[in-house]
């Protein structure tokens, strides 16, 4: 048994006579043999659900669900209730109605086994019948909405008549009907004014019925019509088996360069016309099991369940449904030497589905794991300026397809043929498995005999120790010019273009800092700043070379405080700044301030 509503509303007036009928509550059956029995909760409740008093005023007919006044609610009783409303004005009280037997905690009132009945209290006696407007004669102030479970026996779920009005104003004739299209499953009995379902409903065909209730009032020669919405929602049960959209029960996948744990290898989609179980219960009651195959497969893959609500068209209206994505995911990083082909089966079970048929599906994943070979081009040729400063980035080395790698740990090393000309270093970038070449020793750069540098680049897969090698030829160009006195170690210190460009700083490939002119659009990613190389700094990312020294690019790497208009970077640096941003790495501070517009004018005058 279940209530067709979770809440009911009626009006209460001072000194309304004992015996006055108030309203009916209705229960619908889950099974044909069920017989409803209603029970009122012990207490009346006020604002914020606080108990006010034992309910001594309202009774219920256990078999019919009729609520009526057992005793008149007078001024003093209402005052007594108001005093107990924890200091809030008392305008509405409510009762709880339970269906017997109930498994509910008495203290909780939750649909389907409990409904709240709200009474708006009017500190006046019931108005004269002639003064009541048609709207007041027809419908409660709060519009009802109904909930009906699909596949359940038909039954009565509403009674249109306002009982106090009918009881106290018998001379006013009120008639009701439902406006509905052809073939809808509802009926309003003209004599009893009870609304019932004609047959069991199917949510997968229609989930919402937006009906209209029409009330016609006859008072003497007067006839007036009032219309209100009469919405019915059909509640779901697990009566649909899971299916494969377009019959696709197999997915094929190749694992090659993406070998990292948590990589999604393949996805299969399952469709279920139901929206139960609810999201909180779903993963527990809608299970997926990777069927035992070989131990390697069990350890290497897992299945992740990702349910999502969708809507599908049925009989011209949209109803909700669920799509379940089952993702085959790598459970661990795969070595580049792994080379296997296998078929995996996943059993999906909609455990709440009662039939007919089975709520079970078998998903198939055909997976090929291909080995990866490490290859480097035979030779790299690069040039570097003699003026380059330490940590200047001068190029990249990368095994074939390294940009596509994930879960493959390649380390790069440089072996120099001339011991005294070992100028460069290499660090492996975690982002794209490439090796970044940078200036490590500026003294060697300046030696005249170090005009051409020869290296062997060795790439090693850390897991398997497999290697690839390449020649690296570096030409040293230009001549060394000593830097102006008083230049800071970090380009980022400079606040103006002129001072920026006449100094070098750590990380500068040319020996001179570069000015990046911002777009001046408030707090922007493209703020003005002084950088060792605008190719790499700032770019919103503190790369593996920049991490070696905070002076290289504090705009990307600083963990300290940023003063002025800015948006902090994740996890460090300046994501966006206002005007010009300059930094003092030693003090762990950056400042973002409006552009200094005097600068260009001053330059012109000084010339």
């Amino acid at each position: 048994l279940y209530f067709s509503r979770d809440a009911y509303w009626e009006k209460l007036y001072v000194d309304q006579a004992a015996g006055t009928p108030l309203l009916y509550v209705h229960a619908l059956r889950d099974a044909p043999e069920e017989v409803p029995s209603f029970r009122l909760g012990q207490h009346l409740y006020g604002t914020y659900r606080t108990r006010l008093h034992e309910n001594n005023w309202i009774c219920i007919q256990e078999d019919t669900g009729l609520l009526y006044l057992n005793r008149s609610l007078d001024h003093s009783s209402w005052e007594k209730l108001s005093v107990r409303n924890r200091g809030f004005p008392l305008l509405t009280v409510y009762l709880k109605v339970f269906l017997s037997p109930t498994s509910l905690r008495e203290g909780e009132c939750q649909w389907p086994g409990c409904a709240r009945v709200y009474f708006s209290f009017f500190n006046t006696s019931f108005p004269a019948c002639s003064s009541l407007k048609p709207r007041e004669l027809c419908f409660p102030e709060t519009r009802p909405s109904f909930r009906i479970r699909e596949n359940r026996p038909p039954g009565t779920f509403h009674q249109f008549r306002l009982l106090p009005v009918q009881f106290l104003c018998p001379n006013i004739s009120v008639a009701y009907r439902l406006l509905e299209g052809e073939g809808l499953p509802f009926r309003c009995a003209p004599d009893s004014l009870e609304v019932s379902t004609r047959w069991a409903l199917d949510r997968e065909q229609r989930e919402k019925y937006e009906l209209v209730a029409v009330c016609t009032v006859h008072a003497g020669a007067r006839e007036e019509v009032v219309m209100v919405p009469f919405p019915v929602t059909v509640y779901d049960e697990d009566d649909s088996a899971p299916t494969f959209p377009a019959g696709v029960d197999t997915a094929s996948a190749v694992v090659e360069f993406k070998r990292k744990e948590d990589t999604v290898v393949a996805t299969l989609r399952v469709f279920d016309a139901d929206v139960v179980p609810a999201s909180g219960e779903l993963v527990r009651r809608y299970t997926s099991t990777l069927l035992p195959g070989d131990t390697w497969a069990q350890q290497t893959f897992r299945v992740e369940h990702w349910p999502n609500e969708t809507s599908v068209q049925a009989n011209g209206s949209f109803v909700r449904a669920t799509v379940h994505d089952y993702r085959l995911v790598l459970n661990r990083n795969l070595s580049i030497s792994e080379n296997r082909t296998m078929q995996l089966a996943v059993l999906v079970n909609d455990s709440d589905f009662q039939g007919p048929g089975a709520g079970v599906l078998l998903l198939h994943f055909n997976v090929s794991v291909l080995p990866v070979s490490l290859h480097l081009p035979s030779t790299y040729s690069l040039s570097v300026s003699r003026r380059a400063r330490r940590f200047a980035q001068i190029g990249k080395v990368c095994v074939e397809n390294c940009q596509a790698f994930s879960g493959i740990n390649v380390q790069y090393k440089l072996h120099s043929s001339g011991a005294n000309c070992s100028t460069l270093g290499v660090v492996t970038s975690a982002e794209d498995t490439s090796g970044i070449l940078f200036v490590n020793d500026t003294k060697a750069l300046r030696r005249p005999k170090c005009a051409e540098l020869h290296y062997m680049v060795v790439a090693t897969d850390q897991q398997t120790s497999r290697q690839a090698q390449a020649q690296l030829l570096v030409t040293v160009e230009g001549s060394y010019v000593a830097e102006e006195a008083g230049c800071p170690l970090s380009c980022a210190v400079s606040k103006r273009r002129l001072e920026c460009e006449e100094c070098g700083g750590l990380g500068s490939p040319t020996g001179r800092c570069e000015w990046r002119q911002g777009d001046g659009k408030g707090i922007t990613r493209n703020f003005s700043t002084c950088s060792p190389s605008t190719k790499t700094c700032p770019d919103g990312h503190c790369d593996v070379v920049e991490t070696q020294d905070i002076n290289i690019c504090p705009q990307d790497c600083l963990r300290g405080s940023i003063v002025g208009g800015h948006e902090p970077g994740e996890p460090r640096g300046i994501k966006a700044g206002y005007g010009t941003c300059n930094c003092f790495p030693e003090e762990e501070k950056c400042f973002c301030e409006p552009e200094d517009i005097q600068d260009p004018l001053c330059d012109e005058l000084c010339r």
Partner: antibody
Framework: QVQLVESGGGVVQPGRSLRLSCAAS????????MHWVRQAPGKGLEWVAV????????YYADSVKGRFIISRDNSKSTLYLEMNSLRAEDTALYYC???????????????WGQGTTVTVSS | DIQMTQSPSSLFASVGDRVTITCRAS??????LGWYQQKPGKAPKRLIY???ILESGVPSRFSGSGSGTEYTLTISTLQSEDFAIYYC?????????FGQGTKVEIK
């Protein structure tokens, strides 16, 4: 009718343990939070512990925290109080009581047992 | 923890008297206070909860009032069966705490 019956009291030496039980009948035990309250001879009432209706949560008075453990078996409609490292000051009449909880509010304890006596003495 | 201070600790009264017992909380307990009656050798019995709601079956001569930190139990016309010890209990936050009790004795 609604009834709570405590048992398991007795004389025990300091430092020893004792387990009290409270058998409930006449109501849906699994729907109610349950409490232990004690009263030392000639003294006032002292709240001891509570356990949620579903066993998901518990609270203790500072005087018993870390020594007493409240538990329940909803299938047997029984509340327990495991009392360890007993002291002379734990000597009291121990009552079990049903919590009155409604729509998110606590309203104290509405049904009490008759109590069981615990005497801690060497 | 919330402390409950109950006064007086004892009082002497005659049948027909009006009796008032007060409980003060160390902080606002938002109406979450109950009154319990205990007779010798018996378990406590709830008279009033949520400051002013009378327990079913309790005579209407008992009434409760108060808010914030100050609460009162009133017996409008004392009867012979009302001679007992009365306790207040705050049920606003754990640990719940009782007042020390008020013994109502025959004058």
């Amino acid at each position: 009718q609604v009834q709570l019956v405590e048992s398991g009291g007795g004389v025990v030496q300091p430092g020893r343990s004792l387990r009290l039980s409270c058998a409930a009948s006449g109501f849906s035990f699994s729907s109610y939070g349950m409490h232990w309250v004690r009263q030392a001879p000639g003294k006032g009432l002292e709240w001891v512990a509570v356990m949620w209706y579903d066993g998901s949560n518990e609270y203790y008075a500072d005087s018993v925290k870390g020594r007493f453990i409240i538990s329940r078996d909803n299938s047997k409609s029984t509340l327990y109080l495991e009392m360890n490292s007993l002291r002379a000051e734990d000597t009291a009449l121990y009552y079990c009581a049903r919590e009155d909880w409604d729509e998110g509010y606590y309203y104290g304890m509405d049904v009490w047992g008759q109590g069981t006596t615990v005497t801690v003495s060497s | 923890d919330i402390q409950m201070t109950q006064s007086p600790s004892s009082l002497f009264a005659s049948v027909g008297d009006r009796v008032t017992i007060t409980c003060r909380a160390s902080q606002d307990i938002r109406y979450d206070l109950g009154w319990y009656q205990q007779k010798p050798g018996k378990a406590p019995k709830r008279l009033i909860y949520a400051s002013s709601i009378l327990e079913s079956g309790v005579p209407s001569r008992f009434s409760g009032s108060g808010s914030g930190t100050e609460y009162t139990l009133t017996i409008s016309t004392l009867q012979s069966e009302d001679f007992a010890i009365y306790y207040c209990l705050q049920h606003n936050s754990f640990p719940w705490t009782f007042g020390q009790g008020t013994k109502v004795e025959i004058k």
